[in-house]
Amino acid sequence: HNTTVFQGVAGQSLQVSCPYDSMKHWGRRKAWCRQLGEKGPCQRVVSTHNLWLLSFLRRWNGSTAITDDTLGGTLTITLRNLQPHDAGLYQCQSLHGSEADTLRKVLVEVLADPLDHRDAGDLWFPGESESFEDAHVEHSISRSLLEGEIPFPPTS
């Protein structure tokens, strides 16, 4: 699995999407877990509703929510009031029995508020091609641009 990077800003919300084959994963509950070290299990943060048919209902654990569009094949995780300690390596999982298939590996990056960040020399949002190996970047930040600011680079 390649790793997809989702960059968010401290204090804001971040939405992570994990697409999957809806037929292949039909009837399966989903989960969002965090990899706290190089070795060891992925620690469950939140999982979808116990009844698969109700997977569209948003479930919360603290500031993290999960909802599943089982027809469209998209699992969505929302991290509310993003903070530095939320940064880390996560997985979207499809559950079957005691097993779990990885749908997507996600690197959540929490950056300090860019409204204060006005230095052109800073590596704020590095270009994908020059800075990432086997990674896709999602800039999940929404705000209006300040005068004279350069928009975030587009993502593919």
């Epitope: 990077v5 401290a10 706290l36 070290g37 530095p84 940064a87 880390g88 800075s131 990432f132």
Partner: antibody
């Protein structure tokens, strides 16, 4: 064994810039955040900022924006910090400190520090 | 910014004694607090993270407690090598901040 080797002490003139390095060993460089911390003589510690070597994404203490620039060179697995427009207030020991796995849940390993002296 | 008030600033004790160092945050930081030991000629050492999680290789005489705004580092049965400078640090929000330090000296 994890180690962070920092560049040697420097004496610089006011107004000049300095770039110091932090060369870690014993782990995968891109898996762990790198932080930089300032300690003025006889004073406490002050967090400057952190950089994610995997993406190059950085976050700064507002007190150091415009003063410090953090970069990494993945090819040599080295982290750098550049300080510009130096004044006597910038005379201090600067530490690099490794965060946790793709995060910053405490700084488990520290470099030995780089002493920067700003004097005419 | 989250201010960390560390007390006492200075502490004298004898080997074998138990001491406590306090760290108070200006707002709730949940469990996101670390404790460090600083000794001359050595690199800084992370003792405790997440308020109470003892780091690998750190002796069990070190313990941390607290959450929210009030935290404590306890060193029981002090050893000669424990006399050093101690700092608390929050990583709950940017910018990360440190306490002003506690110097533990031998009586």
């Amino acid at each position: 064994e994890v180690q962070l080797q920092q560049s040697g002490p420097v004496l610089v003139k006011p107004g000049a810039s300095v770039r110091m390095s932090c060369k870690p060993s014993g782990y995968t460089f891109t898996d762990y955040y790198m932080n930089w911390v300032k300690q003025s003589h006889g004073k406490s510690l002050e967090w400057i900022g952190s950089i994610n070597p995997y993406t190059g994404g950085s976050s700064y203490n507002q007190n150091f924006r415009g003063k410090a620039t953090l970069t990494v060179d993945k090819s040599s697995s080295t982290a750098y910090m550049e300080l510009n427009s130096l004044t006597s207030e910038d005379s201090a020991v600067y530490y690099c400190a490794r965060g946790s796995y793709y995060s910053n849940l405490g700084f488990a390993y520290w470099g030995q520090g780089t002493l920067v002296t700003v004097s005419a | 910014d989250v201010q960390l008030t560390q007390s006492p600033s200075f502490l004298t004790a004898s080997p074998g004694e138990t001491i406590t160092i306090n760290c108070r945050a200006s707002k709730s930081i949940s469990k996101y607090l670390a404790w460090y030991q600083e000794k001359p000629g050595k690199t800084n050492k992370l003792l405790i993270s997440s308020g109470s999680t003892l780091q690998s290789g750190i002796p069990s005489r070190f313990s941390g407690s607290g959450s929210g705004t009030d935290f404590t580092l306890t060193i029981s049965s002090l050893e000669p090598e424990d006399f050093a400078m101690y700092y608390c640090q929050q990583y709950s929000e940017y910018p990360f901040t440190f306490g002003s330090g506690t110097k533990l000296e031998i009586k």
